[in-house]
């Protein structure tokens, strides 16, 4: 039996079942009882990623410098520009719209995982026997001085943001 | 039962002119684009002629272009062909045909009616 | 227009035999919008394929359409004593549709 509905890559329209269009180009002209649907490349700055029946192709994105951003994928007639952010920022969101700087840890955490151009800074406190004295984005915990390695003492203990203090043993007479 | 009934046809000096007559029956005439399409003797097919559904565009072989016209009554469930300035190389059976649901593609086709010119 | 070329022009074969028959067209035929007929003397012709691939309806699973752009393809896997006839491609993807001169499968 004939079909009832249109097959893939294809649309019904006035009971015909019409081509459409490949990615990078849009709708001009539904297919007819005699002619083919009429289709035209997407302009330069222009783009559609799927078969489609758009009569107007979308506009690539803008990587907007002002907002921290920068072309990290040119788009072409079937994808997207992709935008990152500049050094020192991540993407507020999925769709990377604006950037913010990376956040640094306080003193008493290390960093976990550096940021990148898409995700923050991941931050994770000292354990006992680390410390970080520091405000940073890239420095991790550090391991307290091991005072017995250089044959001195403990004189103050550690916390997780400072390191221990080493001194003299005392010497009994 | 889809049906298509040509009529018309005959013998015709060159120069002169013939209306075909395609008489539909068994399905919905008003929802389909209709064809002529002609065979010259021991040759093969050559399309002549379509008309829209609703008979608002026409279209046709250069061949033919400028001497023939496709009509078509949908009230009357009949399909036309008006062939003026006969040429002895219009010789041939022609056929009307029904287009296949939602394709363009011929789907139904009368037995034909034989048109012949020569003086 | 496009113009559509068959070859061979005639195929002898055996019935049991598979047949292949080709259509190759001027220009790109958009979308695949490419038709098969069978005719048989003094006989109107009769949809096999449209679309390129699709079979029309009561038409036997042994006759299948393939290809796009600008070459494609008839094959009868196995030929059965009434296949024996003229086969005909049809472009439709912009007036003035055209067809090709035919194939004939012939009795060997």
């Known amino acids: 039996e004939p079909p009832t509905a249109c097959r893939e890559k294809q649309y019904l329209i006035n009971s015909q079942c019409c081509s459409l269009c490949q990615p990078g180009q849009k709708l001009v002209s539904d297919c007819t009882e005699f002619t083919e649907t009429e289709c035209l490349p997407c302009s330069e700055s222009e783009f559609l990623d799927t078969w489609n029946r758009e009569t107007r192709c979308h506009q690539h994105k803008y990587c907007d410098p002002n907002l921290g951003l920068r072309v990290q994928q040119k788009g072409t007639s079937e994808t997207d520009t992709i935008c990152t952010c500049e050094e020192g920022l991540h993407c507020m969101s999925e769709s990377c719209e604006s950037c913010v700087p990376h956040r640094s840890c306080l003193p008493g955490f290390g960093v976990k995982q550096i940021a990148t151009g898409v995700s923050d800074t991941i931050c994770e406190p000292c354990p006992v026997g680390f410390f970080s004295n520091v405000s940073s984005a890239f420095e991790k915990c550090r391991p307290w001085t091991s005072c017995e390695t250089k044959d001195l003492v403990v004189q103050q203990a550690g916390t997780n943001k400072t390191d221990v203090v080493c001194g003299p043993q005392d010497r009994q007479r | 039962e889809v049906q298509l009934l040509e009529s018309g046809g005959g013998l015709v000096q060159p120069g002169g002119s013939l209306r075909l007559s395609c008489a539909a029956s068994?399905?919905?005439?008003?929802?389909?684009?209709m064809n002529w399409v002609r065979q010259a003797p021991g040759k093969g097919l050559e399309w002549v002629s379509g008309?829209?559904?609703?008979?608002?565009?026409?279209y046709y072989a250069d061949s033919v272009k400028g001497r023939f016209t496709i009509s078509r009554d949908n009230s009357k469930n009949t399909l036309y062909l008006q062939m003026n300035s006969l040429r002895a190389e219009d010789t041939a059976v022609y056929y009307c045909?029904?287009?296949?649901?939602?394709?363009?593609?011929?789907?139904?086709w009368g037995q034909g009616t034989l048109v012949t010119v020569s003086s | 227009e496009i113009v559509l070329t068959q070859s061979p022009g005639t195929l002898s074969l055996s019935p049991g035999e598979r047949a292949t028959l080709s259509c190759r067209a001027s220009?790109?035929?958009?979308?695949?919008?490419l038709a098969w007929y069978q005719q048989k003397p003094g006989q109107a012709p009769r949809l096999l394929i449209y679309?390129?691939?699709s079979r029309a309806t009561g038409i036997p699973d042994r006759f299948s359409g393939s290809g796009s752009g600008t070459d494609f393809t008839l094959t009868i896997s196995r030929l059965e004593p009434e296949d024996f006839a003229v086969y005909y491609c049809?472009?439709?993807?912009?007036?003035?549709?055209?067809f090709g001169q035919g194939t004939k499968v012939e009795i060997k």
């Open positions: 068994g399905f919905t005439f008003s929802d389909y684009a």
């Open positions: 220009q790109s035929v958009k979308n695949s919008s």
């Open positions: 045909a029904k287009h296949v649901d939602f394709y363009r593609a011929l789907d139904y």
């Open positions: 679309t390129a691939s």
């Open positions: 008309i829209k559904s609703g008979g608002s565009s026409k």
């Open positions: 049809q472009q439709s993807s912009a007036p003035p549709w055209t």
